[in-house]
């Protein structure tokens, strides 16, 4: 998966918005059975913080074992500490599972810095906040691990929601979610909602904080206001979609929409930041300085280095820009747009300063490999992975960080034309989609 | 070379009101790259950080001094200001002006300082 | 708060030998930390960025190193102009207002 700042953690030619309203093609559609309406015993599921990403409590084994469990939709693996660590509170103890079944093959994920690697293996897995059934799935039993676990972070485990194309050793080890909607009448779509804090918290704070909801095999209406706007998955390996159109504060970053989706751009709840290519990254920077400039921040901030701190309460969040990303829409010729505050793209530290002081990380950064919408993306909104309909949906979130000037947003119809050439195309080789 | 010179009185009553000027001769006070600051330093001690100033007047001023604080800049006049209100004995100190450069983070350019007595 | 601890707080060398000098951090600063000299009567100067790098005008026989929450200013060999106080600042959070203690460097 993504690593940079990407969790574990080791931080166009679209047109310009018309007048022109097309239908829209949102929630305004026939219900589904079982895939809409209330999940009351899945709302507040996830615990956790951007930073350290958010997890689940899930069963393995028989007699079932708990642990907490990373939710990463920017990789397809699900796997777990089997081995005493000094990081880990507690592990998957194989031999204690009567249902465990070795796969007698091992699996080996590198990342650019650190990696971990395990022996494969079946056993019953369940969610107790989540839907009341038991699967049979594919386990990765970490047995070696570097730099992959976080110190703090209270997960044991990794839960990779993305395709079985980007799952190790190769596609045939089918992912958690394949077997789930496989094994039950779970609806093949899950829906996240996470919920940063938006000021630090303190260890003691964070776990015994609320961090968002996972609705598995459904959406849950209390959890967004507004509208859910659907954009196409492109291809199923990661939830790659198309962004056609960047704005901060309004005005038109006006690269090549390619430049905006160059190698991919995937949804990842998984990794802290957004990150952006190193161009698109470049002129995002300059146009948040320059909409900024009454201020002067330290080179080491933009790099997501320094933090910035202000005397508690007087963030002056009025003096940092809206960002606004148009994603491709289900209508030809027709985009939506999601707009982010400085809420969601300065990321509270916690443990730096004194309690006078409210301390902030610049939570976009450079990336080699695409956009990766992660997390302070993802905690301004509601965002439905629609498998079965190959779309991702996004409509405000009921619990995103905001103030009384200005909310995070989700707005359209746009026309943008020519949307389709903002994809872009990767060579086909054999290199490991993980390796970055 | 760019050079920074501290002006002001030398001895000021307490309650006043300590007023010290920061000149910037061989550059200009309006580059987009500095911040200019103000460190205190009282006989005998360590380093005290006040506050700085951009040339846009955009103010940075530390927690335990902020209530008394105020940084100006006058960048017709190639200065910058500062002013500390209701002083005591506490705040007889050596005051330096500087520059704040290498990525608006390290103090990379003093003043000689100069030393302000809170006295009667 | 970051909090930053000198030591020694005073050392004894004489010219020609090796000075070491400490700075911890109370937590990590990463690599942005700063070392300042003072002479008597005189104003700081800029020694060390960023951890490691020199001042425009920083005899090579300073030299700082460190990273995280542990740090360290090398004067490989003591001239009669290096006796001063040195001071570390941390600047990863920001405003730069965090200075260490110090540590005197006299001649013994």
């Known amino acids: 998966t993504q690593h940079g700042i990407r969790l574990p953690l080791r931080s166009g030619l679209g047109g310009a918005p018309l007048g022109l309203r097309l239908p829209r093609e949102t929630d305004e559609e026939p219900e589904e059975p079982g895939r809409r309406g209330s999940f009351v015993e899945m709302v507040d599921n996830l615990r956790g913080k951007s930073g350290q990403g958010y997890y689940v409590e899930m069963t393995v084994g028989s007699p079932p074992q708990t642990l907490n469990i990373l939710v990463d939709t920017g990789s397809s693996n699900f796997a777990v500490g089997a081995a005493p660590h000094p990081f880990l509170h507690r592990y998957y103890q194989r031999q204690l599972s009567s249902t465990y079944r070795d796969l007698r093959k091992g699996v080996y994920v590198p990342y650019t810095q650190g990696k971990w690697e395990g022996e494969l293996g079946t056993d019953l897995v369940s969610i107790p906040h989540g839907p009341n059934v038991t699967v049979r799935a594919n386990i990765a039993a970490i047995t070696e691990s570097d730099k992959f676990f976080i110190n703090g972070s209270n997960w044991e485990g990794i839960l990779g929601l993305a395709y079985a194309e980007i799952a190790r050793p190769d596609d045939s080890l089918e992912p958690f979610f394949d077997s789930l909607v496989k094994q039950t009448h779970v609806p093949n779509l899950f829906s996240l909602q996470l919920c940063g804090a938006g000021f630090p918290l303190n260890q003691s704070e964070v776990l015994a904080s609320v961090g968002g909801s996972m609705i598995i095999g459904g959406i849950d209406h209390s959890l967004y206001t507004g509208s859910l706007w659907y954009t196409p998955i492109r291809r199923e390996w990661y939830y790659e979609v198309i962004i056609v159109r960047v704005e901060i504060n309004g005005q038109d970053l006006k690269m090549d929409c390619k430049e905006y989706n160059y190698d991919k751009s995937i949804v990842d709840s998984g990794t802290t930041n957004l990150r952006l290519p190193k161009k698109v990254f470049e002129a995002a920077v300059k146009s948040i300085k320059a909409a900024s400039s009454t201020e002067k921040f330290p080179d080491g901030f933009w790099l997501g280095e320094q933090l910035v701190c202000w005397q508690a309460g007087t963030t002056p969040w009025n003096i940092f820009p809206v960002i606004s990303l148009y994603l491709m829409g289900e209508v030809t010729n027709q985009s939506f747009r999601i707009t982010i505050l400085p809420q969601q793209y300065l990321r509270p530290v916690e443990d730096v300063a004194t309690s006078q002081d409210d301390c902030y990380k610049f939570a976009i950064s450079q990336s080699s490999t695409g956009t990766v919408m992660g997390a302070v993306i993802m905690e301004g909104f509601y965002v439905v992975f629609d498998r079965a309909r190959k779309r991702i949906g996004f409509a405000v979130s009921a619990c995103h960080v905001h103030d009384e000037f200005r909310t995070a947003a989700v707005e359209g119809p746009f026309v943008t034309l020519d949307m389709e050439d903002c994809g872009y195309n990767i060579p086909q080789t054999d290199e490991s989609t993980l390796m970055t | 070379q760019l050079q920074l010179q501290e002006s002001g009185p030398g001895l000021v009553k307490p309650s006043e009101t300590l007023s010290l000027t920061c000149t910037v001769s061989g550059g200009s006070i309006s580059s987009s790259s500095h911040y200019w600051g103000w460190i205190r330093q009282p006989p005998g001690k360590g380093l005290e950080w006040i506050g700085m100033?951009?040339?846009?007047?955009?103010?940075w001023y530390n927690p335990s001094l902020k209530s008394r604080v105020t940084i100006s800049v006058d960048t017709s006049k190639n200065q910058f200001s500062l002013k500390l209100s209701s002083v005591t004995a506490a705040d007889t100190a050596v005051y330096y002006c500087?520059?704040?450069?290498?990525?608006?983070?390290?103090?990379?350019?003093w003043g000689r300082g100069t030393l302000v007595t809170v006295s009667s | 708060e970051i909090v930053l601890t000198q030591s020694p707080a005073t050392l004894s060398l004489s010219p020609g030998e090796r000075a070491t000098l400490s700075c911890r951090a109370s937590q990590s600063v990463s690599s942005y930390l700063a070392w300042y000299q003072q002479k008597p009567g005189q104003a700081p100067r800029l020694l060390i960025y960023d951890a490691s790098k020199r001042a425009t005008g920083i005899p090579a026989r300073f030299s700082g190193s460190g990273s995280g929450t542990d740090f360290t200013l090398t004067i490989s060999s003591l001239e009669p102009e290096d006796f001063a106080v040195y001071y570390c600042?941390?600047?990863?959070?920001?405003?730069?207002?965090?200075f260490g203690g110090g540590t005197k460097v006299e001649i013994k």
């Open positions: 100033i951009y040339y846009s007047g955009s103010t």
């Open positions: 600042q941390q600047v990863y959070t920001w405003p730069p207002r965090t």
């Open positions: 500087a520059r704040v450069g290498h990525g608006v983070s390290y103090f990379d350019l």
